[in-house]
Interface confidence: low
């Protein structure tokens, strides 16, 4: 479907005469008849197979024809056709004189013809006008013509129908040759297939509209490139869906057992060093001046009894100060002005002269110590508590505060590692010297019997069309990850083909 357009530009009839040579009275009121037909080697009378069109009176004798297309007028003249343009044509243009207002052929005298031209040739569809001029003895006609396609028709012969659309059946505009040009974000033969978000995983993601990325079962993330770990997986990751591979420092079926308490909880205070010593078990090595299981207690600097020879210790903001008894001096009352003659040894200690009597030394009875036997022996000095236990003086006795995992008077006994019931799924626990061992019931394996081996829902290959099967450990069921083009719980149904088009 298209239109043959003829633009009349100028008609010259200087003498104002008809084809017969007779002059028009008072002048030749000129209108045109146009006949468009199939190609003829010699243009001859007969039906105007491609169409006809007539103009009103356009001028008298010689005149230029105004381009009237913008104002809805009739120049260029339109000769529509609804067939494939053959590429060749014959064109007859007749100029007639209208004595009156009735321009019908039967109302005109037979000799009212002013001139007649006939041309034929090849004409390709296109936007460019072909300019032509035909001259006879008395008249001259200048005109141009072209063939263009109707709306929604394209191609060399205006035979290709294409209507732009942006709906379920396609998202495209039409190229000059009638081929589809997809709108941004769409692809495929009919531009029905959305282009997913850049980077969306080809197998694990899909989309129903452009720049979207919807994930198939077992996958997540903006680009559907992150697998979904086992339900309940706390500190673990996966490389395929429903796995739970524990991060460093975590263990157990759901990676929720803390094997790196130091890093995850930072229990040691005041700059102490933390060492892991088993699940949820740790040891804090305190900096000077601190004590307690977590080094949370600040030691008074006087607690280490720095003052000798019976000196009394006073805490100060920036340290401590020793008040020395008579006969002693120095930072720690370590220097003596006494000799054995002054009986400096307390609690029954015996005095021995040194350096020719300039100094002395006390030999203390049991349970006393100090340079003057002035201190009772601290039962914790010998550090009797094993396995990092903390010694506390309690009157005449002493007591050990044990670290987690140890018990006994001197923290010398291991608490059974099995007391925590670490074996999953009814596994039997065995205490070993340096840890524990689980004996697993049938259907389970792993260090803590955390791996289920009894039922593999994928063993029967339930997924069709090369889909990938994943076992959901929590429900003993399978999930099929379908390849592109298939749907259904087992990927058994092909996705419907795109609907056929009306052309």
């Amino acid at each position: 479907s298209g239109v043959f357009q003829l633009q009349l530009q100028e008609f010259i009839n200087e003498r104002g005469v008809l084809a017969s040579g007779r002059p028009c009275e008072p002048g030749c009121r000129t209108f045109f008849r146009v006949c468009l037909k199939h190609f003829q080697a010699v243009v001859s009378p007969g039906p105007c197979t491609f169409g006809t069109v007539s103009t009103p009176v356009l001028g008298t004798n010689s005149f230029a024809v105004r381009d009237d297309s913008s104002g809805g007028g009739r120049n260029p003249l339109q000769l529509p056709f609804n067939f494939t343009w053959p590429g060749t044509f014959s064109l007859i243009i007749e100029a007639w004189h209208a004595p009156g207002d009735d321009l019908r052929p039967e109302a005109l005298p037979p000799d009212a013809l002013i001139s007649k031209i006939a041309i034929q040739g090849s004409l390709a569809v296109g936007q460019n006008w072909l300019l032509d001029e035909q001259t006879s003895t008395l008249t001259r006609l200048r005109y141009s013509y072209r063939v263009i396609c109707s709306d929604n028709y394209y191609g060399d012969n205006c035979s290709r129908l294409c209507k732009k659309r942006n709906d379920h059946f396609g998202h495209y505009v039409c190229q000059p040759d009638g081929n589809l040009s997809c709108l941004p974000g769409w692809t495929g033969e009919y531009c029905q297939q959305p282009i997913c978000l850049s980077g969306c995983h080809e197998q694990n993601g899909y989309c129903s509209k452009p720049a979207e990325c919807l994930c198939r079962p077992g996958w997540q993330g903006r680009l559907c490139n992150e697998c979904i770990p086992h339900n309940g997986c706390r500190h673990g990751t996966c490389s395929t869906p429903w796995q739970c591979t524990c991060d460093e420092g975590w263990g157990g079926l759901f990676c929720d057992q803390d094997l790196n308490y130091c890093t995850h909880h930072s229990p040691c205070k005041n700059g102490a060093t933390c060492s892991n010593s088993g699940q949820r078990s740790y040891t804090c090595t305190c900096r000077p001046g601190y004590t307690g299981v977590d080094c949370e207690l600040e030691l008074s600097e006087c607690d280490s009894n720095p003052c000798r020879n019976g000196g009394s210790c006073k805490d100060q903001e920036d340290g401590y100060h020793c008040l020395c008894p008579p006969g002693y001096y120095g930072l720690h009352c370590e220097h003596s002005t006494l000799s054995c003659a002054d009986s400096p040894c307390f609690n029954g200690g015996s005095c021995r002269e040194r350096n020719q009597g300039a100094n002395y030394a006390c030999e203390c009875p049991p349970n006393f110590t100090g340079s003057n036997c002035e201190k009772k022996v601290d039962r914790c000095t010998s550090n009797p508590c094993a396995n990092g236990g903390q010694c506390l003086n309690r009157g005449p006795s002493r007591m050990c505060r044990c670290r987690p995992g140890f018990t006994g008077t001197y923290c010398e006994l291991h608490v059974s590692d099995c007391a925590r019931n670490p074996c999953a799924h009814g596994g039997t626990c065995h205490d070993l010297e340096n840890g524990l061992m689980c004996t697993c019931p049938a259907g389970f394996s792993g260090r803590r019997c955390e791996v289920r081996t009894s039922i593999d829902a994928c063993a029967s290959s339930p997924c069709f069309n090369r889909a990938t099967c994943y076992t959901d450990l929590s429900t003993d069921t399978f999930v099929c990850n379908c390849p592109y083009g298939f749907v259904g719980s087992r990927c058994e149904f092909p996705v419907g083909l795109p609907p056929s088009f009306p052309w």
Epitope: C182, P184, S198, P210, A211
Partner: antibody, heavy 120, light 110 residues
Framework: QVQLKESGPGLVQPSETLSLTCTVS????????VNWVRQPPGKGLEWMGR???????SHNSALNSRLNISRDTSKNQVFLKMNSLQTEDPGTYFC??????????????WGQGTSVTVSS | DIVLTQSPALAVSLGQRATISCRAS??????????MQWYQQKPGHQPKLLVY???NLASGIPARFSGSGSGTDFALTIDPVQADDVATYHC?????????FGGGTKLELK
């Protein structure tokens, strides 16, 4: 009409944190992505990161550990926080809207930029 | 990351045609789409989008500007060049994360 405006301190000390705000009008943050792009003096443009229409964020991995991008849709604001500022971080920082959430439509509206200097 | 290479400067006469090129280290095409944008930036101003998806003119941009290319080789053409076109022109790809920009080409008048 569509407008974006960056604001924040012009001077930041080395190793301190840069905090910028992009206030938008004329469009909804729940329909369009907003990007942060910076330009060192006399140099080219560097994409830093974006907050998507659904609130998801993505960063340039070269800045990932230092960068945090967030938004408050009720206030029509997008925020950029970058810690441990270094001597190579000064420049003009732009926020830019990404057309209709599709990356192939480009960044069709930009703020006028805010200049950041790193100096003690 | 995809690296975009532009020549630093280009000098043309008023009224002539200017062609600014941008080469990508790998293809920036998805299906039939070439995810390459062009921006104009005048001194002291923010960038302005000229062309998206390699050949689509952004809203309000005069037809003197046009974009072309596919795969790894792209060009921005200004024909004819006017005095107001003196600026730096940046190409930007949005196919892969992270989006990257070229170093910019400074257009100067001869």
């Amino acid at each position: 009409q569509v407008q974006l405006k960056e604001s924040g301190p012009g001077l930041v000390q080395p190793s301190e944190t840069l905090s910028l705000t992009c206030t938008v009008s004329g469009f909804s943050l729940t329909r369009y992505a907003v990007n942060w792009v910076r330009q060192p003096p006399g140099k080219g443009l560097e994409w830093m990161g974006r907050v998507m229409d659904d609130g998801d964020t993505s960063h340039n991995s070269a800045l990932n550990s230092r960068l945090n991008i967030s938004r408050d849709t009720s206030k029509n604001q997008v925020f950029l926080k970058m810690n441990s500022l270094q001597t190579e971080d000064p420049g003009t920082y732009f926020c830019a809207r990404e057309g209709d959430g599709f990356s192939w439509y480009g960044m069709d509206a930009w703020g006028q930029g805010t200049s950041v200097t790193v100096s003690s | 990351d995809i690296v975009l290479t532009q020549s630093p400067a280009l000098a043309v006469s008023l009224g002539q045609r200017a062609t600014i090129s941008c080469r990508a280290s790998q293809s920036v095409s998805i299906s039939s789409y070439n995810l390459m944008q062009w921006y104009q930036q005048k001194p002291g101003h923010q960038p302005k989008l000229l062309v998206y998806a390699a050949s689509n003119l952004a809203s309000g941009i005069p037809a003197r500007f046009s974009g072309s290319g596919s795969g790894t080789d792209f060009a921005l053409t200004i024909d004819p060049v006017q005095a107001d076109d003196v600026a730096t022109y940046h190409c930007q790809q949005s196919k892969d994360h992270p989006p990257t920009f070229g170093g910019g080409t400074k257009l100067e008048l001869k």
